[in-house]
């Protein structure tokens, strides 16, 4: 089964520093998202080989990429306290697959000693449940699609 290997599990960095997050899969992707988890998960980047990556305006100008969508390293620069959070890779395949998440702790330099990562990966409860079905249903499964609502509010 397809899975996403994500590293590191956790990293503590001072304000202004950079962090690398690596997402590796066995291939066969349409693309890969990096999402910051929370009550309203936020898309940070969408990366697809051969095209210009899509980057959230909050990170524009301070994010770099190396590798390919199958083995992608995302470098976030000039980190701010507000960037603290859990970031997860999501591979878009026939089945959507999530990485285990990277907890990024951005701290004031003088408080580095107070905030340290443990060796444990981020708690699974913080991650969305890995989906198990097809991202693009075949016509014969299309009856499972919800009816289009009359109106749908955007966040």
């Amino acid at each position: 089964a397809q899975e996403v290997q994500q590293s590191p599990h956790c990293t503590t960095v001072p304000v202004g520093a950079s962090v690398n997050i690596t997402c590796s899969t066995s291939g066969g992707l349409r693309g890969i998202y990096l999402r910051q988890l929370g009550p309203q998960p936020q898309d940070i980047i969408y990366y697809e080989d051969g095209v210009v990556p899509t980057t959230d305006r909050r990170f524009r100008g301070r994010i770099d990429f190396s590798g390919s969508q199958d083995n992608l390293t995302i470098t976030m620069h000039r980190l701010q306290l507000s960037d603290t959070g859990t970031y997860t890779c999501q591979a878009i395949t026939e089945v959507n697959v999530y990485g285990s998440g990277t907890l990024v702790l951005v701290t004031e330099e003088q408080s580095q000693g107070w905030h340290r990562c443990s060796d444990a990966p981020p708690r699974a409860s913080a991650l969305p449940a890995p989906p198990t079905g097809s991202a693009l249903p075949d016509p014969q499964t299309a009856s499972a699609l919800p009816d289009p609502p009359a109106a749908s509010a955007l966040p």
Epitope: V51, I92, L145, P146, L154
Partner: nanobody, 119 residues
Amino acid sequence: DVQLVESGGGLVQPGGSLRLSCAFPGSAFSFYFMGWYRQAPGKQRELVGDITPGGTANYADSVKGRFTISRDSAKNTVYLQMNSLKPEDTAVYYCNADRRVTIRPDGYWGQGTQVTVSS
């Protein structure tokens, strides 16, 4: 309330062309997979095709080589160019915007636009 707005449907003769548009009224357009689905009378809704945030399109076998999906991030709009139309393409066409957070399209839908292919 806000929703996707499709346009461009209508009556066309077999072999003709139409271009459908779907406007996304939100700033996050560039992160969404944009899909086109269709539903013919008495049939299940089916995928026509979709386009990734990066602009790579995927099509159902029944429309490959005839239909083209594109997106314009400056206009927050996705297009479905339909050429060599056949009577079996007659259906209501729906636009879907989906961030692929769940296992099936669950984001935002348009109200649908009718396409009728008939002589």
